[in-house]
């Protein structure tokens, strides 16, 4: 025997109390799949969240963050404060990168400057709080057509998010 609820499309629910008829989801709710016995409550983008996509009868609302904040977590479950380049977010707010570290983004953590001497290269440009060191070529690398600079270390995502 086929479940009569399987005929209820997305945007409806199968009413337990009314002989399993398909009824539309009420306002501020949705069902993204067919055959559901309940409608889910629409997400509300309040406070530091703003609406990127309105809720419909078949799909949840999607939020992003107001200016000065960026999304964290699956589906932008949290908004984290932006900092300036050359800073990182700590529990006490945005703090400048310590000497020897940099952050070239508005989010994430300060990362150590590239150590040119480990690669046997001279420093071509000193690092700052907002920019990595630029390493020059190895003396032996100075041949025609060779690149004269080493690209900075690739940016990596932070491994933590401040509370």
């Amino acid at each position: 025997l086929q479940d009569p609820c399987s005929n209820c499309p997305a945007g409806t629910f199968c009413d337990n109390n009314r002989n399993q008829i398909c009824s539309p989801c009420p306002p501020n709710s949705f069902s993204s799949a067919g055959g559901q016995r309940t409608c889910d409550i629409c997400r509300q983008c309040k406070g530091v969240f703003r609406t990127r996509k309105e809720c419909s009868s078949t799909s949840n609302a999607e939020c992003d963050c107001t200016p000065g904040f960026h999304c964290l977590g699956a589906g932008c479950s949290m908004c984290e404060q932006d900092c300036k380049q050359g800073q990182e977010l700590t529990k006490k707010g945005c703090k400048d990168c310590c000497f020897g570290t940099f952050n070239d983004q508005k989010r994430g953590i300060c990362r150590p400057w590239t150590n040119c001497s480990l690669a046997g290269k001279p420093v071509l440009m000193n690092g700052t709080k907002a920019r990595d060191v630029v390493c020059g070529p190895r003396p032996a690398d100075l041949s025609p057509g060779a690149s004269s600079v080493t690209p900075p270390a690739p940016a990596r995502e932070p491994g933590h998010s401040p509370q």
């Epitope: 629910f13 109390n17 989801c25 069902s31 016995r37 309940t38 409608c39 889910d40």
Partner: antibody, heavy 122, light 112 residues
Framework: QSVEESGGRLVTPGTPLTLTCTVS????????MTWVRQAPGKGLEYIGI??????TYYASWAKGRFTISKTSSTTLELKITSPTTEDTAIYFC??????????????????WGPGTLVTVSS | AAVLTQTPSPVSAAVGGTVTISCQAS????????LSWFQKKPGQPPKLLIY???SLASGVPSRFKGSGSGTQFTLTISDLESDDAATYYC????????????FGGGTEVVVK
């Protein structure tokens, strides 16, 4: 159709605790389920709900402190992530009957389980 | 978040009398009607009395009557019996994915 909670016990602050709500006579996929608590000498306090499809919604004060999950079609769990002494209470699980046919949680909480006592003390 | 204020507490009446408990919401509940009333006795789980503001739950005597809409709701218990001594709570449903439900603070009914 019935609901029963279990897992309440004495725990020390910071020790995670998981409560279980076992239902019979219906499937969790057919209804919203809610968790409510009552601290000694206090009133009823809404913690959160789970929809038939498994989506969870929490009271603002409970976000991050509690996690509701479904482990089977008849078993619901409430995890108290890091209990404090303020979490000492009787914890109740209840079905939302949605007798008016709205299609989502309406507050028609029935039936209820007898409750399970959680005591947080050092 | 919305707040539900119940008054008065405690309220007392004689057997056979009538008590009226009010529940005032700071914001309108969903559909102006999604408000429930529960009876709570010590050592027992809450019992659903009224749902959707005025609908009587199954097995509940008609002595219990719910009324109201929007932000103002009332539970009236007539022909009071000694077994009605309990604390009564209202709960409202709100259009929010947080604080979807809010309970009132409760009203104790004393039967003399």
């Amino acid at each position: 159709q019935s609901v029963e909670e279990s897992g309440g016990r004495l725990v020390t602050p910071g020790t995670p605790l998981t409560l279980t709500c076992t239902v019979s006579g219906f499937s969790l996929s057919d209804y919203y389920m809610t968790w409510v608590r009552q601290a000694p000498g206090k009133g009823l306090e809404y913690i959160g709900i789970m929809s038939g499809s498994g989506s969870t919604y929490y009271a603002s004060w409970a976000k991050g402190r509690f996690t509701i999950s479904k482990t089977s079609s008849t078993t619901l769990e409430l995890k108290i992530t890091s209990p404090t002494t303020e979490d000492t209470a009787i914890y109740f699980c209840a079905r939302d009957g949605d007798y008016a046919g709205w299609g989502y949680a309406t507050g028609a909480f029935d039936p209820w389980g007898p409750g399970t006592l959680v005591t947080v003390s050092s | 978040a919305a707040v539900l204020t119940q008054t008065p507490s405690p309220v007392s009446a004689a057997v056979g009398g009538t008590v009226t408990i009010s529940c005032q919401a700071s914001q309108s509940v969903v559909g102006n009607s999604l408000l429930s009333w529960f009876q709570k006795k010590p050592g027992q789980p809450p019992k659903l009395l009224i749902y959707s503001a005025s609908s009587l739950a199954s097995g509940v005597p008609s002595r219990f009557k719910g009324s109201g809409s929007g932000t103002q709701f009332t539970l009236t218990i007539s022909d009071l019996e000694s077994d009605d001594a309990a604390t009564y709570y209202c709960t409202g449903r709100y259009n929010s994915d947080t604080d979807t439900f809010v309970f009132g603070g409760g009203t104790e009914v004393v039967v003399k």
